[in-house]
Interface confidence: medium
């Protein structure tokens, strides 16, 4: 019995099509991905193909103005429109909170929307029971197939679930869910869930009766022979993970923002076991055509953005400096803003001990792309932020050793003056630069501010100290040169969307004045 | 319950070749690895490769590569283990193995 | 290659007698270890996989645990019937390696 499965994961907003960078599309002939053209080569593969399922393996939410916008509510309207079989619930679907998550995708989603390791407790367990489901068995063609899911345990960490939903490991959690699966003579069990390459990795070796792993969260790229654009692949599709009881178990995941549809086919024997599985996940390039209705919706659907983009989020009463003159050369008070919204969109309250889990933010200066005249009735718009942050990045938590860090900030005055991008604007941080020492020890002075502190203050960098730090998703790949962040980092987690990070900050403050106040210093 | 039947012993001469059979039984044969360990006598375990019945899929240890050919017959539930230009040093009691259960291994002598 | 070093070689013990057999990987091999138990003549039975899961039918005195890149088969109360050679085994990376060896010989 063969079965068909097509996946998505980290779609993040990509409801229309993007460049090949998953920026927004300029020219539309080489275009890729948004739901149009999804649509046209998943109904492709439906009629070609008898036992078919699409899945998507969590964070369809956050990641463009449409779901600033939208709030959810295009997710569940979009994902319905395509028959999406079972989505897991990524760390991003908590971003608005856990009402944010229920009004518009849990109660609107005509699919089953799944994660075995997250558990309601106290007043939302009833008022969420039944909305999420830790497995779900679907029928395909004459069979049947469980579908189980999770997410990742540091959701807590990275987004907004509140204090009424535990996240527990996922193996620990979702064994018991496939041994129900098993009783209930469901012989075939696809895991699909949002933790990442390693955790897809480590629930195929070592959860029992799982055949197959529909991973996301890492945005990993895997791909057998040539590969079609510019993503580079981390392994083989489907990678092949040997599970403890020694069964071959495909592992796979679909890169990021809607760009491939992964195609997996799956061959079971009559006992349920996985005979083969081979595929390659489809670059959805304009050589497929955006399928016409879903192009009309999305058209209908795009008007209320246009008019967003336009309206005031909040004044600003000083000029806000995102000029090159400064921002590559000097503390800026639009890095400052920037920074202060980064840390301000983390705020995540650990226990006790710790006033939160993360207090700093590095920020490159070429990244900074406008400045805001105040003198416009001091209006800031979405438009305005656009055009300041124009990249459709993100803002992103990743774990670093002091010094790594320390090697950063050599970097970030390495060829000080040249007027380029890598001079770094900070928050949590006092640096202290001498440009006369030769390049390479330049920092006479790195302070951070504490986070296992109740009253935040400044501690001289501990080299050998993990810290954690927020910054753009461009440096977390080793963008500007900062190839030690790229080489180093112990841990990464994607963000929120930029511009909306530091347009949720404004409309939550109304009104800013951020200063220059010597974060950067020269001596 | 799980059994992995082999072939029985083997004697040889120099440059010769040996084949041992694996036969399986009480589980889904293509589903699962299947490995070859041998055992000199008085030493320890040494692995050889594994096979994937279900797709031919072979993976070798280096030091057998090029004289071990590792193949299974998926309609008789028979893994097979060839190994070619035998020398005095390849006389051992040859294991197959899953993940958990074991053959009852086949000895292997390589004398002129 | 993974390298793994088992210590001791072999050791003498008495019935009723706490065991422990240490198994240090070359590097990180995560959990995907086994622990094997050989009589002479006979072939080798798994007895503990991944570290510390105890297969099917094998006593509760028998257990694994770890420590970075250091593993541990501990006997609580050696047995009559215990006495053998014990391998550990990595399935992390190719090729799959073995220990040397422990033999546990009665006292």
């Known amino acids: 019995w063969e079965l068909t499965i097509l996946h998505t994961n980290d779609v993040h907003s990509r409801l229309e099509q993007t460049s090949e960078d998953s920026s927004k599309c300029v020219n539309a002939s080489r275009c890729m991905g948004g739901v149009a053209r999804l649509f046209t080569k998943v109904q492709q593969i439906r009629r070609a193909e008898p036992n078919v399922l699409l899945l998507d393996a969590g964070d369809q939410y956050q990641g463009t103005i449409w779901f600033t916008v939208y709030k959810g509510a295009e997710v569940a309207h979009f994902m319905n429109a395509l028959r999406y079989d079972a989505m897991a619930l990524g760390n991003h679907e908590f971003d608005n909170g856990v009402e944010g998550l229920i009004e518009p995708l849990l109660k609107e989603a005509k699919f089953p929307i799944l994660s075995a390791n997250i558990k309601a407790k106290g007043p939302l367990a009833s008022q969420i029971s039944g909305l999420y489901l830790p497995y779900k068995v679907l029928p395909v063609g004459d069979e049947v197939v469980g579908i189980v899911g999770y997410t990742s345990k540091e959701t807590p960490f990275l987004s907004n679930p509140g204090t009424n939903l535990v996240f527990e490991d996922e193996i620990t959690a979702l064994q018991p869910e496939v041994d129900k699966l098993k009783t209930l003579n469901v012989n075939k069990i696809i895991a699909l869930g949002h933790s990442g390459f390693e955790m897809d990795k480590l629930i195929a070796q070592k959860v029992r009766g799982v055949d197959v792993v529909v991973g996301g969260h890492s945005n990993t790229f895997l791909y057998t022979g040539n590969p079609p654009s510019k993503e580079v692949p981390a392994g083989k599709y489907p990678f092949i993970v040997t599970s403890d009881d020694g069964r071959k178990v495909p592992v796979v995941q679909a890169y990021a923002f809607g760009k491939y549809l992964g195609y997996l086919k799956i061959e079971f024997d009559e006992r349920g076991n996985v005979i083969s599985s081979h595929g390659n996940p489809i670059l959805l390039n304009s050589s497929i055509p955006e399928d016409p209705s879903i192009k009309a919706d999305i058209n209908k659907w795009r008007i209320k953005l246009d008019n967003y983009s336009t309206q005031e989020l909040g004044k600003t009463i000083v000029y806000l400096d995102g000029s090159s003159q400064s921002c590559r050369f000097r503390e800026c008070n639009m890095g400052n803003l920037i920074c202060d919204a980064m840390i301000n969109n983390n705020l995540r309250h650990a226990d006790e001990t710790f006033w939160n889990h993360v207090s700093m933010c590095i920020l490159n200066g070429g990244g900074i792309r406008s400045p805001i005249d105040e003198r416009n009735n001091g209006t800031i718009t979405w438009e305005n932020l656009a055009a300041v942050l124009p990249f459709g990045g993100t803002f992103d938590l990743v774990q670093l050793k002091g010094s790594t860090l320390k090697k950063a900030f050599e970097h970030s005055v390495h060829r000080y003056g040249q007027s380029t991008g890598e001079f770094l604007q900070v928050g949590g941080i006092h640096v202290v630069y001498d440009l006369s020492r030769k390049p390479g020890d330049r920092v006479v002075k790195l302070d951070v501010l504490c986070t296992k502190c109740r009253v935040p203050s400044y501690d001289p960098l501990k080299m050998d100290e993990v810290y954690k730090v927020i910054l753009p998703n461009f440096l977390a790949n080793g963008g500007d040169g900062f190839q030690m962040i790229k080489d180093e980092l112990l841990r990464h987690d994607s963000g929120d969307q930029d511009i909306n990070v530091v347009s949720t900050y404004i409309s939550k403050m109304k009104v800013i004045y951020p200063a220059v106040e010597g974060r950067i210093k020269f001596s | 319950q799980v059994q992995l039947v082999q072939s029985g012993a083997e004697v040889k001469k120099p440059g010769a070749s040996v084949k041992v059979s694996c036969k399986a039984s009480?589980?889904?044969?293509?589903?699962?690895?299947i490995n070859w360990v041998r055992q000199a006598p008085g030493q320890g375990l040494e692995w050889m490769g594994q096979i994937y019945p279900g797709d031919g899929n072979t993976n070798y240890n280096r030091n057998f590569k090029g004289r071990a050919t590792l193949t299974a017959d998926k309609s008789t539930s028979t893994a097979y283990m060839e190994l070619s230009s035998l020398r005095s040093e390849d006389t051992a009691v040859y294991f197959c193995?899953?993940?958990?259960?074991w053959g009852q291994g086949t000895l292997v002598t390589v004398s002129s | 290659d993974i390298q793994l070093t088992q210590s001791p070689s072999s050791l003498s013990a008495s019935v009723g007698d706490r065991v422990t057999i240490t198994c240090r990987a070359s590097?990180?091999?995560?959990?995907?270890l086994i622990w094997l138990q050989q009589k002479p003549g006979k072939a080798p039975k798994r007895l503990i996989y991944a570290t510390s899961s105890l297969d099917s039918g094998v006593p509760s005195r028998f257990s694994g645990s770890r420590s970075g890149t250091d593993y541990t088969l501990t006997i609580s109360s050696l047995q009559p019937e215990d006495f053998a050679t014990y391998y550990c085994q990595q399935y992390s990376g190719y090729p799959l390696t073995f220990g040397q060896g422990t033999k546990v010989e009665i006292k």
């Open positions: 590097q990180d091999i995560g959990d995907s």
């Open positions: 193995a899953g993940f958990a259960d």
């Open positions: 009480g589980y889904v044969f293509s589903s699962y690895w």
